[in-house]
């Protein structure tokens, strides 16, 4: 666990100032040998891999996406899975490895030359008629930050907050994710009482801006603890 690692958090072998491998405690994560890591249709073994629990793609690595490990599995149990390579099956952009996106259920290269026209097509296909889910994965139109040179303005489709312009974050809106304004002091925010609860929101709020945190409004007295209003407040 995090705390057990932190109780002995001194670095024994200092890394060089730049480059080289770090002698960071626990960098060789202990795991049972031969743990299989799903990637595309085949399984590959990743050294020292331990499945990481997640609620959304942003909690996983850049070469992963967040999903139930089994087809049609319990949507409440999600882990970070290896991204799908080109020509592998997909249901949303985040499932495809960096430099690829999901088109007609297949991961294809996000080649700058022909990408822009195709993505409009994909958005229409994904959202034109129905908003159902497949195999427990929610349909999303999300784009890799490597696909566009310009930062998304408010309302632009995104994959992660780094796709959005300064002062905006990438948050869920219906079955897509778009750039929304980062919350300011006094604005209502969402405090997730249990990990994974934000996976259920279809209108996700941004996080509080720099120097602010989401806390119970001091003057907001209600009988139920869970229904108290949370706002962005100074640290």
């Amino acid at each position: 666990t995090l705390n057990s690692v932190l109780n002995s958090n001194a670095i024994k072998n200092l890394p060089p100032p730049l480059g080289g491998a770090a002698g960071h405690p626990g960098s060789a994560v202990s795991a049972a040998p031969g743990i299989l890591y799903p990637g595309g249709n085949k399984y590959q073994t990743i050294d020292n891999y331990q499945p990481y629990p997640c609620a959304e793609d942003e909690e996983c690595g850049t070469d992963e996406y967040c999903a139930s490990p089994t087809r049609g599995g319990d949507a409440g149990v999600q882990i970070c899975l290896a991204c799908r390579k080109r020509r592998k099956r997909c249901m949303r952009h985040a499932m495809c490895c960096p430099g690829n996106y999901c088109k007609n259920g297949i991961c294809v290269s996000s080649d700058q030359n022909h990408f822009r026209g195709e993505i409009e097509e994909t958005i229409t296909e994904s959202f034109g008629n129905d908003h159902s889910t497949l195999d427990g994965y929610s349909r999303r139109t999300t784009l890799s930050s490597k696909m566009y040179h310009t930062k998304g303005q408010e309302g632009s489709v995104c994959l992660r907050s780094s796709d959005c312009a300064s002062g905006l974050c990438c948050a869920r809106h219906f079955w897509s994710k778009i750039c929304k304004p980062v919350l300011k002091e006094g604005q209502v925010c969402t405090k997730h009482r249990r990990k994974g609860s934000h996976g259920l929101e279809i209108f996700q709020r941004c996080y509080c801006g720099e120097g602010l945190s989401c806390r119970i409004q001091k003057d907001h007295h209600q009988a139920s603890n869970s229904s108290r209003l949370h706002t962005c407040q100074r640290h």
């Epitope: 995090l2 690692v5 932190l6 958090n9 890394p15 730049l18 480059g19 080289g20 491998a21 770090a22 960071h24 405690p25 626990g26 960098s27 994560v29 990743i46 891999y49 331990q50 990481y52 997640c54 959304e56 942003e58 909690e59 996983c60 690595g61 850049t62 070469d63 992963e64 970070c80 290896a82 960096p98 930050s145 490597k146 992660r160 907050s161 780094s162 996080y207």
Partner: nanobody
Amino acid sequence: EVQLVESGGGLVQAGGSLRLSCTASGSAFSSHVVGWFRQAPGKERDFVTAINWSGARTAYADSVKGRFTISRDNAKNTAYLQMNSLKPEDTAVYYCAAGRDRYARDLTEYEYLWWGQGTQVTVSS
């Protein structure tokens, strides 16, 4: 390769605040985990806090929980460490470090491949 430069260190009185910045150049910053570490005179370098590529996950050493806040702005290729309620025992050279965030794991268990030169933080009583 990623080059990291820390700034914002200095001398502050106990109870005061400082905000450190770690600015990156080179490889894509937005795909890296960023950590802050500190080294007091005669001691080993310790983990302080870390943040994943998206900012969705953070971790803190017990000694700084509730006082320090890590954040990042990928558009500016910069990570921040807001340090409040500083104590004399927070005196150290603070280093920022970055590592590839391809596969999620405990934020204390990343291999930090690139390191800044450090910035001195001195807290007087």
